[in-house]
């Protein structure tokens, strides 16, 4: 077989057609997509493309420039009339660049055999493209049958002379692929047996996926497999100030394009996800943990002065339980429980009390009673010591009511009930709760039990009770409690010497209900049973006593 | 009661250098940002600088920048503005004011200043 | 830099009456619905003293009679009825991005 070596094809003006056809076709270059990496774009190239052509008179290049005085390379053949035409034009070294799966994109013009006169015997519409791997940059003299075929090229598209009069172009684009590719490099060859060709453009790139960031991971520029089905499997890595809980692939498909992806990062505590990147949080924001999507203000009752911070700071007089998360606001101990009353029975106390006015902001309220023994003369207190039982129980009441038995007859007795929260352990402030000081009694006051109501306005209620059948002892005051019924909650406490009291800033008509007990030296009585009397209406008169049975 | 008490100025040659400090009480140093803010004879507030609590943020004025350091030691309750290369346009007094904790902060407490005379 | 433009730069007004202040901010100073706006008031030879925050907060201990309002770059600091210890000067500040930037300060006198 003959030798493809041979010396550079001289450029020789080119007919007409070629040059209308070439300066109309080329002025189109588009640019390449941003997942083909070219080898070779034969039209920017700037110099000598260092081309070969065997046997010289075959293929011979056309020294054309385009509208910015580009050299244009173009190739053309048209040996129609001749028979037996073998015609090669062999590229220089084309190196992969570690492809091993390349594209080669030809852009040519055929002429129709039909419309030459003469040559239809041995005129062609199809020429033959090869390619022949090497490591070599100098190892073009090579043997045609060492040349791999990689097709047979027909043009879509061919012209004839009409076509040719009217300027109108017909440049066909083929693409073909070779692959697997295992040496560093290649040559391309294009065999002529009897067209009329004109060879605008050769282009040979591979395919990659572009670099990427998707879900904050950064996946590199990843060349495509050879085999055409091929999925690549490619590890991302994590963005600045990201992590990740599953290291995050994706899949880079045959045709340059990032499929299936898997895993993710995330912006870690203290950053947050903005156009692609973890940014900082700002003084003032906080992020607890990578799985929170963004900064999110501080709490109620802190703060942060800090880039990046993960929790923020209490702020005076606030805490936080280690339990409590991040994001909840800080809290402060309750204030002191209110109206506290107290109900002795010989030697047990019940005392009862409402939450107070201030829970700190917290859920978790109970209650610790402390019990002090005191000695009415000296004035000194003591603890009350073991032998005193708390019904239910002393500390984490959630009640609003405790029970103590067992106490000593005729003793004046302290209680203070304080009230606790999640944070009171973390305050060295001052304790907070209310006292009630009692006097055990075997015998306190009976209750009260005949009560008159007197004047009735729309705003008050007078009543008049009388003492209590069994005083036990000279009757020191009286307790009034009373609330508007069906708010037992929210009640008022009256005292009075007498028995008689008006009760004043009422609402008008309503019901409220009363509830009297006396106290002597020896301690309160039980309360009386509940005595419901309504105020009046805006513009009712008013109303004057009846006895209530 | 929080106070904020500032020292170490005084007349200084241009290109010299001064140490400033501010002595916190009253409140947890550790946890506030604190800026110092100049203020020239007769002219408006300036902000020079901040540094966060733990040291972790800090920022500067353009005016200032690769001149001035701010600095804090917590163990001391103190902050510092280090002052390099003086020019006379940094006469003023000097003020350092804690960040507040009700958000957006501003600066809550101001010390009565420290005065800075920078003069051949 | 965001430059802070205040306006007037003083101004005289009667005992009693409503002063108005008025400052500008080179671009917005809000960020995630709030406003990063701060006023100070001065005395001569005394420290500032921050009044409001937020654009629109009052500082605790500070009287009600100052308030503040705005958002984005148009911002107005109010007394609605001048007392004599408000003679002062007073600031501006956006803290929204460092440099935190001060306006140039307005002189207020008691007609």
């Known amino acids: 077989p003959a030798s493809l070596a041979g010396c550079y094809s001289a450029p020789r003006r080119a007919p007409l057609w070629t040059c209308l056809l070439l300066c109309a076709a080329l002025r189109t270059l588009l640019a390449s997509p941003s997942n083909e990496v070219n080898l070779l774009d034969s039209r920017t190239v700037m110099g000598d493309l260092g081309w070969i052509a065997f046997p010289k008179n075959g293929w011979e290049e056309i020294g054309e420039v385009d509208e910015n005085y580009a050299p244009i390379h173009t190739y053309q053949v048209c040996k129609v009339m001749e028979q037996n035409q073998n015609n090669w034009l062999l590229t220089s070294w084309i190196s992969n660049e570690g492809a091993s799966r390349i594209f080669i994109e030809l852009k040519f013009t055929l002429r129709d055999c039909n419309s030459l006169p003469g040559g239809l015997g041995t005129c062609k519409e199809t020429f033959n493209m090869y390619y022949f791997e090497s490591d070599d940059q100098n190892g073009r003299n090579i043997k045609e049958n060492q040349y791999i075929k990689i097709d047979t090229i027909a043009a879509d598209e061919s012209f004839t002379e009409l076509d040719l009069g009217d300027r109108v172009m017909k440049l066909n684009t083929e693409v073909r692929d070779v692959g697997p590719l295992s040496k560093k490099g290649f040559y391309l060859a294009f065999q002529d047996v009897g067209a009329c060709i004109a060879l605008v453009s050769v282009r040979v790139y591979y395919k990659k996926c572009p670099s990427v960031v998707r879900h904050l991971a950064v996946f590199p520029d990843t060349i495509t497999g050879a085999d055409s089905s091929q999925l690549l499997e490619v590890s991302g890595s994590c963005v600045n100030h990201s992590v990740t809980d599953e290291p995050p692939k994706m899949h880079c498909s045959a045709e340059g394009e990032w499929l299936v992806p898997i895993g993710k990062c995330m912006c870690k505590a203290g950053y947050e996800e903005k156009n692609g990147t973890c940014q900082v949080c700002r003084p003032g924001f906080f992020k607890a943990s990578p799985h929170i999507q963004s900064c999110g203000k501080c709490p109620p009752h802190s703060y942060t002065h800090e880039e990046a911070s993960t929790s923020c700071v209490c702020e005076k007089d606030y805490f936080r339980r280690e339990s409590d998360p991040p994001t909840m606001a800080c809290t402060r101990p309750p204030s002191a429980p209110r109206n506290a009353i107290s109900n002795v029975n010989e030697t047990s106390v019940f005392l009862e009390w409402i939450p107070p006015a201030d829970t700190g902001g917290r859920k978790d309220v109970s209650y610790y009673i402390a019990c002090k023994k005191c000695n009415s003369h000296a004035g000194v207190c003591e603890e009350c010591g073991g032998h005193v039982r708390y019904l239910p129980r002393q500390s984490g009441l959630k009640n609003t009511s405790v029970m103590m038995v067992d106490l000593l007859a005729h003793t004046n007795y302290t209680f203070e009930i304080e009230a606790v929260n999640g944070v009171s352990d973390l305050s060295p402030g001052a304790r907070q709760y209310v006292s009630v000081n009692v006097t055990t009694n075997q015998a306190a006051p009976s209750p009260v039990t005949n009560v008159k109501k007197g004047k009735i306005a729309k705003n008050s209620i007078s009543l008049s009770w009388q003492e209590p059948d069994r005083p036990n002892g000279i009757i020191l005051e009286y307790e009034i409690k009373y609330f508007e019924k069906d708010q037992e909650t929210s009640y008022t406490i009256i005292k009075s010497k007498e028995t008689t009291i008006t009760a004043e800033g009422l609402k008008p008509a309503s019901v409220y209900v009363f509830q009297i007990r006396a106290r002597t030296a020896a301690g309160y009585g039980v309360f009386s049973r509940r005595f419901e009397f309504e105020t009046t209406p805006v513009f009712a008169a008013s109303s004057d006593q009846s006895q209530i049975p | 009661e929080v106070q904020l008490v500032e020292s170490g100025g005084g007349l200084v040659q241009p290109g010299g250098s001064l140490k400033l400090s501010c002595a916190a009480s009253?409140?947890?140093?550790?946890?506030?940002?604190i800026h110092w803010v100049r203020q020239a004879p007769g002219k408006g507030l300036e902000w020079v600088a901040y540094?966060?609590?733990?040291?972790?943020?800090?920022y500067y004025a353009d005016t200032v920048k690769g001149r001035f350091t701010i600095s804090r030691d917590n163990s001391k309750n103190t902050l510092y503005l280090q002052m390099n290369s003086l020019r006379s346009e940094d006469t003023a007094m000097y003020y350092c004011?804690?960040?507040?904790?009700?958000?957006?902060?501003?600066?809550?407490?101001w010390g009565q200043g420290t005065l800075v005379t920078v003069s051949s | 830099d965001i430059v802070m433009t205040q306006s007037p730069g003083s101004l005289a007004v009667s005992l009693g009456e409503r002063a108005t202040i008025n400052c500008k901010a080179s671009?917005?100073?809000?960020?995630?619905?709030?406003?990063?706006m701060n006023w100070y008031q001065q005395k001569p030879g005394k420290a500032p003293k921050l009044l409001i925050y937020?654009?629109?907060n009052l500082e605790s201990g500070i009287p009600d009679r100052f308030s503040g309002s705005g958002s984005g770059t148009d911002f107005t600091l109010t007394i609605s009825r001048l007392e004599e210890e408000d003679a002062a000067s007073y600031y501006c500040?956006?803290?929204?991005?460092?440099?935190?930037?001060f306006g140039q300060g307005t002189k207020l006198e008691i007609k």
């Open positions: 004011a804690r960040y507040g904790t009700s958000f957006p902060y501003g600066l809550d407490y």
């Open positions: 009253g409140f947890t140093f550790s946890t506030f940002g």
């Open positions: 540094i966060s609590g733990a040291s972790t943020t800090i």
């Open positions: 671009q917005s100073v809000d960020y995630d619905g709030d406003s990063y």
């Open positions: 937020g654009a629109s």
């Open positions: 500040q956006q803290s929204n991005e460092d440099p935190f930037t």
